[in-house]
C-alpha cells in the first residue's frame, strides 16, 4: 500500500531536525525505545509524540535554550516549531488519544530524534516497496 503523506512529512521534519545540533538537543528525554519489544507501532508513535510534547512544554520558555540574543531566540523558536510539527504528525499517524510513558531510561533529544528517524525510514521502506 502507498506510504501515508504524514509519514513522508515526519521523515522530512526529522531530516531537518537532525541536520544540526543545538545546546537544547543535548538535553534529555524519556527513552521509550529502550524497552519497546511488546509495543505496537501505533503505541510507539503515540509515546514518541508524548515525549516530544513533554519536552517542548517544559523547555519552550527555558532561559538556557532561549539564549541572550535575538539570533539564539530564533534558533530555539525554530527547534520548538519543528518539534510541534513532528508531535502533530505523530499523533495523526498513531490515531490514539493517550498513552503512558513510564520508562526510567533517558536519552538526549538528539539521539531520540535519530532513533525515531531510523524507525520512520524503516517503515517508509516497507510501505513503499
Amino acid at each position: 500500500h502507498k506510504c501515508d503523506i504524514t509519514l513522508q512529512e515526519i521523515i522530512k521534519t526529522l531530516n531537518s531536525l537532525t541536520e544540526q545540533k543545538t545546546l537544547c538537543t543535548e538535553l534529555t528525554v524519556t527513552d521509550i525505545f529502550a524497552a519497546s519489544k511488546n509495543t505496537t507501532e501505533k503505541e510507539t508513535f503515540c509515546r514518541a509524540a508524548t515525549v516530544l510534547r513533554q519536552f517542548y512544554s517544559h523547555h519552550e520558555k527555558d532561559t538556557r535554550c532561549l539564549g541572550a540574543t535575538a539570533q539564539q531566540f530564533h534558533r530555539h523558536k525554530q527547534l520548538i516549531r519543528f518539534l510541534k510539527r513532528l508531535d502533530r504528525n505523530l499523533w495523526g499517524l498513531a490515531g490514539l488519544n493517550s498513552c503512558p510513558v513510564k520508562e526510567a531510561n533517558q536519552s538526549t533529544l538528539e539521539n531520540f530524534l535519530e532513533r525515531l528517524k531510523t524507525i520512520m525510514r524503516e517503515k517508509y521502506s516497507k510501505c513503499s516497496s
Epitope: 541536520e19 545540533k21 543545538t22 540574543t69 539570533q71 516549531r81
Partner: antibody, heavy 118, light 107 residues
C-alpha cells in the same frame, strides 16, 4: 536536492538601482531563513541581511539599512534584494545563502556579479 | 558590532601537514562560531558550525574548537583539495560577521 539560483546582476551606473533574485528549490522555503552575503573583488565575505521566511522580517547590517530591501515571494520560493543608490564600493559578487536549521549558512547560490561604474 | 580577527592571513603548507587557523572575537560569542571554505570563483561551503560540529559530508580531518572569544580550525592532514581560503563567522548576534580570511597555499 537543495538549489539556490541568483539572477539580476549586471552593470549599473552610480546612483542607480538593481533587483537581485534568488530562486530556491528542493526544500520547504519557509522552514529556513535566507541571507545575502557579498564579496568585493579580491576581498573577504561581508554579511548583508537575513530574513525570517516564516514572518518575512528582515535584519540588516547597519551599512545597508535604508538603501537595500530584502523581500520574499513565498508562492514562487524566491527572495529578492532591491538595491538603491548604488555606489562604486557596492561592486561585488552577491550570494544568497540558506540559513542552516539552527546555525550558519548551509547552502549557497553560485553568486551574481554587480558592477557599479560610470 | 562583533569583530572577528583571523590569523594568519595566509600560510604555506605541504600535503600531509597539520594546519591551524585561529579566530578571535571582539567579545564573547559563547559557542556560536562557524567556519567556511572557499575556492577561487566558487561560493563558500560550510565546514563547521556551533564551534566544533562538522557539517554533513565534511571530512573528519577538519575539526573546530574553542569558546567565548577564541576559536580554532584544524586540518589534521592537509589534502590537495584543501588549498583554499577559510573564513570564520559568528552567528551569536546580528550583524553576523566574518573574519578577513586565511589563504592556505601550497608550499
Amino acid at each position: 536536492e537543495v538549489q539556490l539560483v541568483e539572477s539580476g546582476g549586471g552593470l549599473v551606473q552610480p546612483g542607480g538601482s538593481l533587483r537581485l533574485s534568488c530562486a530556491a528549490s528542493g526544500y520547504t522555503f519557509t522552514d529556513y531563513s535566507m541571507h545575502w552575503v557579498r564579496q568585493a573583488p579580491g576581498k573577504g565575505l561581508e554579511w548583508v541581511v537575513w530574513i525570517n521566511t516564516e514572518t518575512g522580517e528582515p535584519t540588516y547590517a547597519d551599512d545597508f539599512k535604508g538603501r537595500f530591501t530584502f523581500s520574499l515571494d513565498n508562492s514562487k520560493n524566491t527572495a529578492y534584494l532591491q538595491m538603491n543608490s548604488l555606489r562604486a564600493e557596492d561592486t561585488a559578487v552577491y550570494y544568497c545563502a540558506r540559513g542552516g536549521i539552527f546555525y550558519g549558512m548551509d547552502y549557497w547560490g553560485q553568486g551574481t556579479l554587480v558592477t557599479v561604474s560610470s | 558590532d562583533i569583530q572577528m580577527t583571523q590569523s594568519p592571513s595566509s600560510l604555506s603548507a605541504s600535503v600531509g601537514d597539520r594546519v591551524t587557523i585561529t579566530c578571535k572575537a571582539s567579545q564573547s560569542v559563547i559557542n556560536d562560531a562557524a567556519w567556511y571554505q572557499q575556492k577561487p570563483g566558487k561560493a563558500p561551503k560550510l565546514l563547521i558550525y556551533y564551534t566544533s560540529h562538522r557539517y554533513t559530508g565534511v571530512p573528519s580531518r577538519f575539526s573546530g574548537s574553542g569558546s567565548g572569544t577564541d576559536f580554532t580550525l584544524t586540518i589534521s592532514s592537509l589534502q590537495p583539495e584543501d588549498f583554499a581560503t577559510y573564513y570564520c563567522q559568528q552567528d551569536y548576534t546580528s550583524p553576523w560577521t566574518f573574519g578577513q580570511g586565511t589563504k592556505v597555499e601550497i608550499k
